[in-house]
Each structure stands twice: as C-alpha cells, then as structure tokens.
C-alpha cells in the first residue's frame, strides 16, 4: 500500500532571465527512494539516481543545475519555460509517486511565489 505523500513548491512564478529551484519532498513512507526524475509533459529534464548520480538531458545542460538535494535549479528562464513540471519518485517497495509544479515565467519584475501544497 502506498502511504507516502509528495509535497512540492506548488504554483510558483519567477522573472524572465532569473532562476528558480524546483523542489519536491516525499514523506509519510519508509520506502527507499531509488531515483527521482524531473520531467515536463513530453521530455525528460534530469534524473537523480540514488546510486549513480545525476543525468541531465543535453537540451537542458546549459541552464539546469542539479540540486539542492533531489531538487533541480532552472536558470536563464524564458517565457517558454512556463508550464507544468513533474517530480517522479521511484521508490522501493511502494512504486512511483508523482508531484506537480506549475511555473509561470513573468516578463515583469513582480514574481510572487505560490503557497506549498501536497499531492497524495
């Protein structure tokens, strides 16, 4: 039975040209995290394998930095980065947990962070 929950940074906004940290946290389970994938709907951004370390997709290598922790830092943001991001936790023995973050990249200098929320 999957008892865990993923807490994410929720709906967030950031300025064009700036950077943002995408963070998820898995709680309420003793399952072992074997790998975390960071994805958009149609493509892989990065993988953090607990044993083998990080893989960053070549199309993001210039502006994605691993961490902090299992998170991902997106740099040099453009308005095209607006959209949904998913953290996919591969765990043993529970299976897969998925968290969702919506990022809005703003032209203006007003970029307020949304509240954190949980996805069961």
């Amino acid at each position: 039975m999957m008892t865990g929950t993923i807490e994410t940074t929720g709906n967030i906004s950031a300025e064009k040209g700036g950077s943002i940290i995408l963070q998820c946290h898995l709680s309420s389970t003793t399952a072992q995290v074997t790998q975390v994938n960071w994805e958009q709907q149609d493509q892989l951004l990065a993988i953090c394998n607990a044993d083998l370390g990080w893989h960053i997709s070549p199309s993001f290598k210039d502006r994605v930095a691993p961490g902090p922790g299992l998170g991902l830092t997106l740099q040099s943001l453009t308005v095209n980065d607006t959209g949904e991001y998913f953290c996919i936790y591969h765990t043993y023995p529970d299976g897969t947990y998925t968290g969702r973050i919506f990022l809005e990249v703003l032209e203006s200098s007003v970029a307020e962070h949304g509240a954190r929320f949980q996805i069961p």
Partner: antibody
Framework: QVQLVQSGAEVKKPGASVKISCKTS????????LHWVRQAPGQGLEWIGG????????SYAQKFQGRATLTVDKSTSTAYMELSSLRSEDTAVYYC????????????WGQGTLVTVSS | DIQMTQSPSSLSASVGDRVTITCRAS??????VVWYQQKPGKAPKLLIY???YRYTGVPSRFSGSGSGTDFTFTISSVQPEDFATYYC?????????FGQGTKLEIK
C-alpha cells in the same frame, strides 16, 4: 584523451570467481560513472551494473545482484568487477564503459575481456 | 524492467541506400534513448543520444528521433564502413536495457 584499458582474458572453472580490472586515464576519475556490460558469443549487450566512483554507490541488474561486485580504487583510477559462482553461461566478453559528466550515455568503452567458463 | 524491442533484427542494404531501424520501449522513457554501433570483435561506439544528438565525430548521415515509446535510427546514405550491428538502449531507469540488435549487412 579518455582511455579505458581492461585486464586480459581469463579461463575459469564452474563455481570459481573472476575479477576484471578497468584502468582509466584522461579525465578526472570521480566525475564519470563506470558501467559493466557483457556480451555472450553471438548475442546482444547486457548491462550488469554501474558504480559512481565519487561515492562508491552501485546499481546492479537484478540478475547479477549478489553475484557481481563492483568496486573502484581511486588511487589508481581503476574499476573492478568481480563475478562469483561462475557457470558456463557466464562465458562472454565483459566491457567496462564510462558515461560522461552528468550523463548516462556510455561514451567511452574498454576493449573488452573474454571470460571463458569451462570444466 | 523496461524492454527495448528493436526491428528488424537484420537488414540488407546497398551502399547509398537509406536505412531505418526502429526501437520500441515497453513503457514511456521520454527522450532517454541512445544508439550504438558495434563491429565484430570490437567494443560498441556511441553514435546518437537523447535521442537525436550526434556524438562527437559522428557523421551527419546518422540521425535519431522519437520520444516516449517509439524511436527511430536512420542512416541517410549507407557507406561501406557502416555495415555493423546497431543497438538501442534506454537509460530512463535501471536496469539500463538494450535492444536485441539489428545487423546491417551488404546486399
């Protein structure tokens, strides 16, 4: 340039163990993950497992869990793969392969080590 | 484990032909697929990664495409040195798995 040089061919009896080395050069040893892949005669490629030289973290294919052991010696920039309880179906060419910085693609390969298991 | 199914298993072509090899993953692997070339008695060589980037020094006649579960590897004009076996591999999750290989032979 990046080089992976493996130890020579081995002939072993069933039940024995074999330990193959993979000496690397041309890059910072702790920056690239090292993997082991085998190929039985006339067959395809099979991933055995990988090791992160930075922290010693290992990942194995289930088939080899408990029978293969991957280690590294940072002082000599060398990776090792030991396979125990050998059987005839373990006869294969064993390759070490390096994946680049923040990458899982196997960009660098050793020349291969033929292990023959025969009574 | 993720299965990678390659087709065809063998392929005959003449120099100058355009050839296409396909690889199907048993589940979504996004863009985490690479292609290798192997010649008899030699170690594999990385050709294409993620899955449309040519590795350093790889000629432009080699290309790759696809995302999700379906991937394609193409040689636009086969050269004599291209006759070899080609493998796809996924690195979306461990264990990293290979296709069974496609042997490209001279017609």
């Amino acid at each position: 340039q990046v080089q992976l040089v493996q130890s020579g061919a081995e002939v072993k009896k069933p039940g024995a163990s074999v330990k193959i080395s993979c000496k690397t050069s041309g890059y910072t040893f702790t920056e690239y993950t090292l993997h082991w892949v085998r190929q039985a005669p006339g067959q395809g490629l099979e991933w055995i497992g990988g090791i992160n030289p930075n922290n010693g973290g290992t990942s194995y294919a289930q088939k080899f869990q408990g029978r293969a052991t991957l280690t590294v010696d940072k002082s000599t920039s060398t990776a090792y793969m030991e396979l125990s309880s050998l059987r005839s179906e373990d006869t294969a060419v064993y390759y070490c392969a390096g994946s680049g910085y923040y990458d899982y693609s196997f960009a660098y390969w050793g020349q291969g080590t033929l292990v023959t298991v025969s009574s | 484990d993720i299965q990678m199914t390659q087709s065809p298993s063998s392929l005959s072509a003449s120099v100058g032909d355009r050839v296409t090899i396909t690889c199907r993953a048993s589940q979504d692997v996004k863009n985490a697929v690479v292609w290798y070339q192997q010649k008899p008695g030699k170690a594999p060589k990385l050709l294409i990664y993620s899955p449309s980037y040519r590795y350093t020094g790889v000629p432009s006649r080699f290309s790759g495409s696809g995302s999700g579960t379906d991937f394609t590897f193409t040689i636009s004009s086969v050269q004599p040195e291209d006759f070899a076996t080609y493998y796809c591999q996924q690195h979306y999750s461990t264990p990293f798995t290979f296709g069974q290989g496609t042997k490209l032979e001279i017609k």
